[in-house]
């Protein structure tokens, strides 16, 4: 056990490999095209290390001429995955990430899957469906979410430090009770952010402080009993 002045509480969510999808139910395929066109772009936050399925507009595959997935990831050339129905051929250009694949054969399912989403999958994904009635698009601004690791410790008398390490986007830290606080953010090259909040409590009847970390992946609270003021022996409450 560490000394209380450095007493550490840590938290990191463990995810079973979950799967997320914005795909529509097959029953909705019959909906009219104007609804599809009204939903051209979607912002989509996805937890890191989960599986994601991205969908094309809900158009029956029998009406299809060409399906193209265009993938634009930060710092990489645009990748395209295309399927031509007439010749039943698929073609890829500048696609190097083996975790981004068709869900199954594109003549059966036009959806795209990302297996075990990573930070590098942040980007824009667009399905373009060419049909006799025109071209239909659906785009996704995929935002990869990274759960921060949360720690709480004391570094000196009646001062506590709460850190939300390597979260994406940045976490928000609040305290119960409120103290005299300073918050700093540190930005990492992979797009994650570490937030550090250092607080001091002068009020001597504060026994335990709670750090509450709010994040898109979920909230976490940790608490710690404050050390006594040096030299303070007896206090009546």
């Amino acid at each position: 056990q560490p000394n209380n002045s450095l007493m550490l509480q840590t938290s990191k969510e463990n995810h079973a490999l979950a799967s997320s999808s914005l795909c529509m139910d097959e029953k909705q395929i019959t909906q009219n095209y104007s609804k599809v066109l009204a939903e051209v772009n979607t912002s989509w936050p996805v937890k890191m290390a989960t599986n994601a399925v991205l969908c094309c507009p809900p158009i029956a595959l029998r009406n299809l001429i060409i399906i193209t997935w265009e993938i634009i990831l930060r710092g990489q050339p645009s990748c395209t995955k295309a399927y031509k129905k007439e010749t039943n051929e698929t073609k890829e250009t500048n696609c190097t990430d083996e975790r981004i694949t068709w869900v199954s054969r594109p003549d059966q399912n036009s959806d795209l899957q990302i297996r075990t989403v990573a930070i590098t999958h942040d980007g824009y994904y667009r399905c373009i469906m060419v049909t006799p009635d025109g071209n239909f698009h659906r785009g996704y601004h995929l935002q990869v979410l990274v759960t921060p690791e949360v720690t709480l410790f004391q570094n000196r008398n009646r001062t506590a430090v709460c850190k939300a390490v390597a979260g994406k986007p940045a976490a928000h830290i609040s305290w119960i009770p409120e103290g005299d606080c300073a918050t700093k953010q540190e930005y990492w090259s992979n797009g994650t952010v570490t937030v550090k909040s250092t607080c001091h409590w002068e009020v001597h009847n504060v026994s335990t402080v709670t750090c509450h970390v709010s994040h898109l992946t979920g909230n976490k609270s940790l608490y710690i009993e404050l050390l006594p003021v040096p030299g303070a022996k007896k206090s009546a409450k």
């Epitope: 119960i176 504060v206 335990t208 050390l227």
Partner: antibody
């Protein structure tokens, strides 16, 4: 796994004093506050005070101020709670607890009767 | 001192029913708390720490929620062994203070 082992039941006369002990194991004794809570028969729970064994710093609830003394022996990882000038309404089970109230002793019954 | 108002003080509920107990901190002061279960002749047993964290080994039918000054303890489907008295404890300020307790009996 933190364990708190308390001393046995006591029967005292009004006006006397009682000293209850609580021996801790499984954590760094000097690094965690130790609290005392009591419960009179059929009543709720009442916080009495706490002690930080690392420095001997203490807080007493004002209700017990002047009658209660909490001490710690770091060599044996034991805390003590002494209550003086006992009266019948001090008949209660006395608990020690630590780790921000997440670990409790089994309690010590103190009966004050003439 | 922070007073913890716990309600109801007692209730009689059937097996399988949902039970809700609340604790409210006085003075509008935000606090953190634990929830305990106590059976006759036993020490209180911690069920929920830090308002909403289920302790290891505690059945998932128990849950806690809330923040700031208002907190709720819930048993989703009451079992016969849940007959006991339940307490909240605020541990943010000295003196620590308990709710008055809720005695839960099975109909």
């Amino acid at each position: 796994q933190v364990q708190l082992v308390q001393s046995g039941a006591e029967v005292k006369k009004p006006g006397a004093s009682v000293k209850v002990s609580c021996k801790a194991s499984g954590h760094t004794f000097t690094s965690y506050w130790m609290h005392w809570v009591r419960q009179a028969p059929g009543q709720g729970l009442e916080w009495m005070g706490n002690i930080y064994p690392g420095s001997g710093s203490i807080n007493y609830d004002e209700k017990f101020q002047g009658r209660v003394t909490m001490t710690a022996d770091t060599s044996t990882s034991t805390v003590y709670m002494e209550l003086s000038s006992l009266r019948s309404e001090d008949t209660a089970v006395y608990y020690c607890l630590t780790m921000t109230g997440t670990s409790w002793g089994r309690g010590t019954l103190v009966t004050v009767s003439s | 001192d922070i007073q913890m108002t716990q309600s109801p003080s007692s209730l009689s509920v059937s097996v399988g029913d949902r039970v809700t107990i609340t604790c409210q901190a006085s003075q509008g002061t935000p606090i953190n708390l634990h929830w305990f279960q106590q059976k006759p002749g036993k020490a209180p047993k911690l069920l929920i720490s830090g308002a909403s964290n289920l302790e290891d080994g505690v059945p998932s039918r128990f849950s806690g929620s809330g923040s700031g000054t208002e907190f709720t303890f819930t048993i989703s489907s009451l079992q016969p062994e849940d007959a006991a008295t339940y307490y909240c404890l605020q541990f943010t300020y000295i003196p620590w203070t308990f709710g008055q307790g809720t005695k839960l009996e099975i109909k």
